[in-house]
């Protein structure tokens, strides 16, 4: 589910026509072009496994395939966080792990992957068709989420292989961080190419390679994902979602998430992947953790008359670094 942009293949000029200076001038544009072409988006993979020993026990494993430092991970079920999903756990690399029943044991497996054991019975018991989602907030990529569920026919003890399920959602800082550098590089590249064009230099020859040649993964949403904005939220059957959780659905307002399960009925072996459109930026990157709690499937329960919404509790040290990571 990546948006891809075609990049025309450029041929270097024939040697000897511009001399050493020309070669040196063109090294930087080629490096920048390579960066522009190969720069990819991070990915999140989700693996859901039902334990053979206990049919009501699930293990969810999630990982982040990106170069940034992870500042928060949120695991939810019943759909993406903030779109009807209910938070099961929040894992902060500096502050610890906050989890809600029926989550039993959330933990970091590596610097970029986590696992969560779910146990339950009755109303708070997950079942095979429950969708589990993992959202990784990282710097500078922003916030990325993917979802998965057990294939309906899978045997206990088996699991779908971890499948990368990227989502085209990046918070402002992620876009400005990585994309900003790339955008600057690409603009500079075009500037150099334009300068180069205005000289009596040799022309760029028509491509002799396949038109499918290098492809750049773009940050902008594709037409398909833009169309997703107009698609009503489609939830995989989650009849086993809990009725007794302390966390409930997010409060009012339209959801910015529009999800499109990418797996078809005839292809049930992989976890569900969810596409989404970039959501409006919330002002600053530090607000990602606020957002996670503000949409984390909370109820505003039994609140007194004066309850108002504030930025989420992170303590006074929260601003010392991205999401309190110092």
């Amino acid at each position: 589910m990546r948006t891809e942009a075609q990049v025309p293949a450029l041929q270097p000029p024939e040697p000897g026509l511009e001399g050493a200076m020309g070669h040196r001038t063109l090294v930087l544009p080629w490096v920048l072009l390579t960066l522009c072409v190969t720069a990819g988006t991070p990915e999140v993979w989700v693996q859901v496994r039902m334990e053979a020993t206990e049919l009501s026990s699930f293990t969810i494993r999630c990982g982040f395939l990106g170069s940034g430092s992870i500042s928060l991970v949120t695991v939810s079920w019943g759909g993406p966080n903030g779109a009807g999903g209910t938070t099961l756990a929040v894992l902060h690399p500096e502050r610890g792990i906050r989890q809600w029943a029926p989550a039993r044991q959330a933990r970091w497996e590596t610097q970029s992957s986590i696992s969560l054991i779910l146990e339950g019975s009755g109303a708070s018991s997950p079942c095979a068709n429950t969708t589990f989602c993992c959202k990784f907030a990282s710097f500078p990529e922003g916030s990325w989420e993917a979802c998965g569920s057990l294939p309906p026919s899978s045997d206990p003890g088996l699991s779908a292989p971890p499948t990368p399920a990227p989502i085209l959602r990046a918070d402002l800082a992620g876009i400005l961080g990585v994309s900003g550098v790339l955008l600057f590089g690409c603009v500079y590249l075009l500037h150099l190419l334009r300068r180069h064009k205005h000289r009596p230099a040799p022309r760029l020859q028509p491509s002799r390679t396949s038109p499918q040649a290098p492809r750049a993964r773009a940050w902008a949403p594709s037409q398909a994902s833009q169309a997703a904005l107009h698609v009503p939220y489609a939830t995989i059957n989650t009849s086993c979602r809990p009725a007794t959780l302390d966390t409930a659905h997010p409060h009012g307002g339209p959801s910015w998430w529009a999800s499109l399960p990418t797996h078809a009925a005839h292809r049930p072996q992989g976890p569900a992947a969810w596409a989404s459109t970039p959501i409006p930026a919330r002002g600053s990157f530090v607000s990602v953790e606020n957002g996670l709690y503000a949409q984390a499937g909370e109820r505003p329960p039994h609140t007194g008359p004066g309850l108002t919404l504030f930025p989420d509790p992170r303590g006074p040290r929260a601003m010392e670094g991205p999401l309190g990571v110092r």
Epitope: E94, G96, Q99, W108, A294, E298, L309, F310, P316
Partner: antibody
């Protein structure tokens, strides 16, 4: 300075409910989760649950899940903990405590405690 | 839930001497991400609420005298009072602050010999 002031001692009959309050001052109230911890006479400490004052999000210890309700009134910077279906083993000192700014579950400021006695 | 076990239950130490209290957790409290151990120590004097002394196993809370020090990693932790003072008589609790629900040790009563 940070102050957490709790309501006074309570004597309740088995089966009744008790509601303890904790008024916070001296810091940004919405910025810290508030926790409730109890201590039976001569015993250790037991975590009951926590509440996010900024949005009312709660998280309860499984052992108390069906009997406890935590609420917040931001206009008075007060959190409440209500425990229902009281039994004699609920006799304890109940503390509210604020979480430490750099970790979710270390508790750096505590109320003075509220003794709840359950007796027939 | 993570089970915290303290030893000894009670301890008598002479004034000016070193006091050592141990705490063991049923699973590792070491966070692989930042290599911090999520273990806290509290002091509770009679009729008072607990007071945070140390968190992250060895980080002293502001205002806590430097005779109090925490050490250990993984599942085994120690609180050391280098030179016992009369005002240190109290019950000391360890607590894991790594994940929900936070759990406490049973406490160690420290007295003067």
């Amino acid at each position: 300075q940070v102050q957490l002031v709790q309501s006074g001692a309570e004597v309740k009959k088995p089966g009744a409910s008790v509601k303890v309050s904790c008024k916070a001052s001296g810091y940004s109230f919405p910025s810290y989760w508030m926790h409730w911890v109890r201590q039976a006479p001569g015993q250790g400490l037991e975590w009951i649950g926590e509440i996010n004052p900024s949005n009312g999000l709660t998280n309860y210890n499984e052992q108390f899940r069906n009997r406890v309700t935590m609420t917040v009134d931001t206009s008075t910077s007060t959190v409440y903990m209500e425990l229902s279906s009281l039994r004699s083993e609920d006799t304890a000192v109940y503390y509210c405590a604020r979480h430490h700014g750099s970790t979710y579950y270390a508790l750096d400021s505590w109320g003075q405690g509220t003794l709840v006695t359950v007796s027939s | 839930d993570i089970v915290m076990t303290q030893s000894p239950d009670s301890l008598a130490v002479s004034l000016g001497e070193r006091a050592t209290i141990n705490c063991k957790s049923s699973q590792s409290l070491l966070n692989s991400i930042n290599q911090k151990n999520f273990l806290a120590w509290y002091q509770q004097k009679p009729g008072q609420p607990p007071k945070l002394l140390v968190y992250f196993a060895s980080t002293r809370e502001s205002g806590v005298p430097d005779r109090f020090s925490g050490s250990g990693s993984g599942t085994d932790f120690t609180l050391t009072i280098s030179s016992l003072q009369a005002e240190d008589v109290a019950v000391y609790f360890c607590q894991q602050h790594y994940s929900t629900p936070p759990t406490f040790g049973g406490g160690t009563k420290l007295e003067i010999k």
